[in-house]
């Protein structure tokens, strides 16, 4: 009975040609959608002139189909029982699942101005940049279409800067026709408890973005976990989107299309300051913005973004300290809408449903020498957008799963 099932599961979750796991792993059978909500700034002039609170109004969802491309360069290594691959990126706009079109306009922070003033902090350099910003008629805020904001546009200020500056700017630029990886993961042939766990990412076991244990690449990519998941487990996974490994803990039993699954959630503790959670000390990379590492709920990933001052948080600054959201009006965080969860079928370890939620923010600081930032009296971590990436097992797949896995066990 049970032993036979265990044996079958162990065989079928191995990542090699011919298994159920492999087929779904190479190309996900689940439709994955990424919804975007853009934070439209309502008072750009008041912010720029008087350093007022930034009033934002979220607009969305704007929905794209993602993760529809099969993994590329899939290569088994029999010697160390790993399989390596690239995860290609692609996004297709879904008008029927969106509130508008990709041509909709938004008032957002000027990404290039904010980034350049942060990267080039020398006053002489800033004075030169100021002349370029003025010449290009750029300002602290800009109006951009959804397509431009997400996928890239030629920035007029950066276009005045000679080589070697990239003049195209976009929150996810470049995306289409690019790939994430190379990932090298254990295929589970020799040890099923290691299946899907990442061995190396881009040829390394560490990221080189953080100090100490924060820099480690832990666990899987969250699409699946080793089988026979226990409620007491802390599930580690790596997310290249946020340039770090993170973890999820059991929250509740859920019935998903007749399949019993465990809902694992990212706990607030994962976003806590080192004061609250000492393990997080190495995610605090500077002292000023973090108020001596007492702020929480935002992650400075600038080291992973070529120095651009990108901060990742949960949507609407959920689980973030009051000082972070204080300069921003119009945010309404709530757990149900804004937290991340994974619904995992415990026998196979497959993630059958998930909602990955995150917010992209940019730091903008006052600058004595840059006219459009001169009147700012404080630092702002400015929300640009938040996203909800979701996937749910299809009805057909769920039926197959029930009959072949959970049905047999019950």
């Amino acid at each position: 009975g049970d032993l036979l099932i265990q044996k079958t599961i162990k065989k079928q979750v191995v990542l090699e040609e011919g298994t159920i796991a492999f087929k779904n792993w190479v190309k996900t059978g689940t439709e994955v959608y990424r919804q975007f909500w853009i934070f439209d700034v309502q008072n750009p002039q008041e912010v720029m002139m008087n350093s007022s609170n930034i009033q934002v109004k979220q607009r969305g969802p704007y929905t794209y189909r993602v993760r529809f491309l099969a993994k590329e360069n899939v290569t088994q290594d029999a010697e160390d029982n790993t399989v390596s691959f690239l995860q290609p990126n692609g996004a297709i706009f879904e008008p029927s699942l969106s509130v508008g079109t990709e041509a909709d306009n938004f008032t957002v922070l000027n990404l290039a101005v904010a980034a350049a003033s942060h990267i080039y902090q020398n006053q002489f350099v800033q004075m030169i940049l100021n002349s370029l910003i003025n010449k290009s008629k750029s300002s602290m805020f800009q109006v951009r279409t959804l397509r431009e904001l997400l996928w890239g546009y030629r920035d007029p200020f950066l276009s005045l800067v000679p080589y070697p500056v990239t003049t195209t700017v976009g929150l996810f630029y470049p995306y289409n026709n690019t790939a994430d990886g190379v990932y090298k993961v254990f295929n589970g042939k020799d040890n099923i408890s290691k299946v899907a766990i990442i061995d190396t990412y881009k040829g390394k076991r560490n990221l080189s973005y953080w100090e100490s244990h924060c820099d480690m690449i832990n666990g899987t990519d969250a699409a699946s976990f080793p089988p026979f998941v226990e409620k007491s487990q802390v599930l580690q996974f790596f997310s290249s989107d946020i340039c770090r490994s993170i973890y999820a803990v059991f929250e509740s039993d859920v019935n998903l299309k007749g399949i019993p699954v465990y809902r694992f959630v990212l706990p607030s503790k994962a976003f806590a300051s080192p004061v609250e959670n000492p393990d997080n000390y190495c995610f605090c990379t500077e002292k000023i913005i973090s108020k001596n590492c007492t702020s929480y709920g935002v992650l400075d990933i600038s080291k992973c973004k070529e120095g651009r001052p990108v901060y990742i948080s949960l949507p609407h600054f959920l689980y973030a300290s009051p000082d972070v959201s204080e300069p921003i009006d119009g945010l309404n965080p709530n757990e149900e809408e804004h937290r991340t969860y994974l619904d995992i079928e415990p026998i196979t370890g497959f993630t059958l449903q998930f909602a990955k939620r995150l917010q992209v923010n940019l730091l903008v600081k006052p600058s004595e020498k840059i006219q459009v930032l001169k009147n700012l009296k404080r630092n702002y971590i400015v929300p640009i957008l938040w996203l909800n990436e979701t996937g749910t097992i299809g009805d057909e797949k769920a039926n197959m799963f029930r009959s072949q896995v959970t049905g047999k066990i019950n």
Partner: antibody, heavy 122, light 107 residues
Framework: EVQLQQSGPELVKPGASVKISCKTS????????MHWVKQSHGKSLEWIGG????????AYNQKFKNKATLTVDISSNTAYMALRSLASDDSAVYYC???????????????WGQGTLVTVSA | ETTVTQSPASLSVATGEKVTIRCITS??????MNWYQQRPGEPPNLLIS???TLRPGVPSRFSSSGYGTDFVFTIENTLSEDVADYYC?????????FGSGTRLEIK
């Protein structure tokens, strides 16, 4: 090899103006900033200002704001500094110095001209 | 304006001895301090740039340290060819400002 060749010595009367040149070679003129530095006899160095030839953007030391004007001629890869209303305390050696403009934490005043002696005397 | 106080104004050492020059700034400039050597009749020559970075081709007997407001420039095993004026420059904020200089002589 990067070279900065400055114009020759100048003897000028008080109240007059002078324009010093700094001809560059061995690098892409528009990608480097050009600074000007004053050194009075037996004294220290003073930064006058800098210019970015690519777009003509300038930054001045307030002390020299009404004294010096920095310009460039991209066609001849030459930087100029004009000094006006000259007085005896403007007598000094004036240097041009240049640097590659890209990024923070890079060196300042890497390449220097040989200096131009300006003497203000009646 | 950030003022830079350089000391000593002059010093005389025997060859092989160690030289230490200090610059103190009136504001915190992180590690944005540069050091120059100026031999008689020549323009200054950059020895060490921001972040205590020894420039290519500069002998390793020259070094610097410091952060914030207090900076030290050192020559180990001074040679006769090191006779020159030495200047520090803060490049953190405008206007850039130089120290008053240190004249190094050999006994």
């Amino acid at each position: 090899e990067v070279q900065l060749q400055q114009s020759g010595p100048e003897l000028v009367k008080p109240g007059a103006s002078v324009k010093i040149s700094c001809k560059t070679s061995g690098y892409t003129f528009t990608e480097y900033t050009m600074h000007w530095v004053k050194q009075s006899h037996g004294k220290s160095l003073e930064w006058i200002g800098g210019i970015y030839p690519y777009n003509g953007g300038t930054a001045y030391n307030q002390k020299f704001k009404n004294k010096a004007t920095l310009t460039v001629d991209i066609s001849s890869n030459t930087a100029y500094m004009a000094l006006r209303s000259l007085a005896s305390d403007d007598s000094a050696v004036y240097y041009c110095a240049s640097d590659y403009f890209y990024g923070d934490g890079y060196p300042w005043f890497t390449y220097w001209g040989q200096g131009t002696l300006v003497t203000v005397s009646a | 304006e950030t003022t830079v106080t350089q000391s000593p104004a002059s010093l005389s050492v025997a060859t092989g001895e160690k030289v230490t020059i200090r610059c103190i700034t009136s504001t915190d400039i992180d590690d944005d301090m540069n050091w120059y050597q100026q031999r008689p009749g020549e323009p200054p020559n950059l020895l060490i740039s921001e972040g205590n970075t020894l420039r290519p081709g500069v002998p390793s007997r020259f070094s610097s340290s410091g952060y914030g407001t207090d900076f030290v420039f050192t020559i180990e095993n001074t040679l006769s060819e090191d006779v020159a004026d030495y200047y520090c420059l803060q490049s953190d904020n405008l206007p850039f400002t130089f120290g008053s200089g240190t004249r190094l002589e050999i006994k």
